[in-house]
């Protein structure tokens, strides 16, 4: 089993869109397959696909979950917040017939304010 | 280019063991998502998968000769070997060493080949 | 174990003509959930290894003559040369990877009439 996560890096617009592709390879054919995603750590869900469909399509905040065959499961982020920055990290274990698993490198998101000058303020008003 | 290189004695003398080796060139057998195989052809037949050797070390056998085979790699030498024990006649096959990913499922790289005779 | 049973075991085709060799397997090779048909067509000429022709039932390998195809999903499954060419004397197998063991047909001996 091999997973390769995508983009490595993804800067995006707060309110805007933000799409993590996860591709789930193995040589066999798996019955069940359990998938994870998480987010500096903390995980924001944890479905299965089982007969080509996931059990579960919302994923953390704002946050949905799709699998397209033969391999692609993508998280979309829509709208996107400040606090969806951070670390994402793609896990699959083959359940069904044997267990297998693997995860993805790290996907870094950085959210833009929508209001650049939103930046300059909270630093400016850092107190002392 | 890929290459699969097997090597090892043609004639093996029954109830010892068979020890093949394939040396791979063109591309580093600890690249993630590979399975390193052994498939044989007795003489005039069809192709017999033995095992695998999967780039996180684990192995995978062909239950009609599990209690007979290990699959091992050696990364510093870029290559992986058969052992298979208390061979008899039935063993004689031209012994194949291949590479599947887990992208394709197919065996895309084969050696020439190497055959091993069982024979007193 | 799933078992593939190629037929015929030879086969004798005039230059130019259609050959077809049948694969059937004893359980269904096709994944709902990644939509595949676990299948593939190797090519193995005299004193060769053999050599990927056809993989997921119906791609064809890149380079591959495009008179070779794959066609077939669940158990049944073909491979098809549209206009034998004298360069394709040869056995033909199919090879499923649905499941370990991964298993191979007996294999179709092709020769010119």
């Known amino acids: 089993l091999s997973v390769q996560q995508g983009p490595n890096l993804l800067q995006v617009r707060q309110g805007s869109q933000a799409t993590l592709v996860c591709q789930v390879d193995q040589a066999t054919a798996w019955e069940r397959l359990r998938v994870k995603w998480t987010k500096d750590g903390a995980i924001l869900c944890q479905p299965y696909i089982t007969n080509g469909s996931l059990s579960l399509g919302v994923c953390g905040p704002q946050g949905r979950l799709s699998w397209q065959a033969p391999s692609h499961l993508t998280l979309q982020l829509d709208p996107v917040s400040l606090n969806h920055s951070g670390a994402y990290v793609c896990w699959a274990a083959v359940e069904i017939p044997e267990l297998e698993e693997a995860e993805g490198n790290i996907t870094r998101l950085f959210v833009d304010p929508d209001d650049p000058t939103q930046n300059r303020n909270r630093i400016a008003s850092f107190p002392g | 280019q890929v290459q699969l290189q097997e090597s090892g004695p043609g004639l093996v003398k029954p109830s010892q063991t068979l020890s093949l080796t394939c040396t791979v060139s063109?591309?580093?057998?600890?690249?993630?998502?590979?399975?390193w195989s052994w498939i044989r052809q007795h003489p005039g037949k069809g192709l017999e998968w033995i095992g695998y050797i999967y780039t996180s070390g684990r192995t995978y056998y062909n239950p009609s000769l599990k209690s007979r085979v290990t699959i091992s790699v050696d990364t510093s030498k870029n290559q992986f070997s058969l052992k298979l024990s208390s061979v008899t006649a039935a063993d004689t096959a031209v012994y194949y060493c291949?590479?599947?990913?887990?992208?394709?499922?197919?065996?895309?790289?084969w050696g020439q080949g190497t055959l091993v005779t069982v024979s007193s | 174990d799933i078992v593939m049973t190629q037929s015929p075991d030879s086969l004798a085709v005039s230059l130019g003509e259609r050959a077809t060799i049948n694969c059937l397997s004893s359980q269904s090779l096709f994944s709902s959930n990644t939509k595949r048909n676990y299948l593939n067509w190797y090519q193995q000429k005299p004193g060769q290894s053999p050599k990927l022709l056809i993989y997921?039932?119906?791609t064809r390998l890149s380079g591959v003559p495009d008179r070779f195809s794959g066609s077939g999903s669940g158990t049944d499954f073909t491979l098809t040369i549209s206009s034998l060419q004298a360069e394709d004397v040869a056995d033909y197998f199919c090879q499923q990877h649905y499941e370990t063991p991964l298993t191979f047909g007996d294999g179709t001996r092709l020769e010119i009439k």
């Open positions: 291949a590479d599947m990913a887990d992208k394709g499922g197919w065996f895309a790289y």
């Open positions: 997921h039932a119906s």
């Open positions: 063109g591309f580093s057998i600890t690249t993630g998502g590979y399975y």
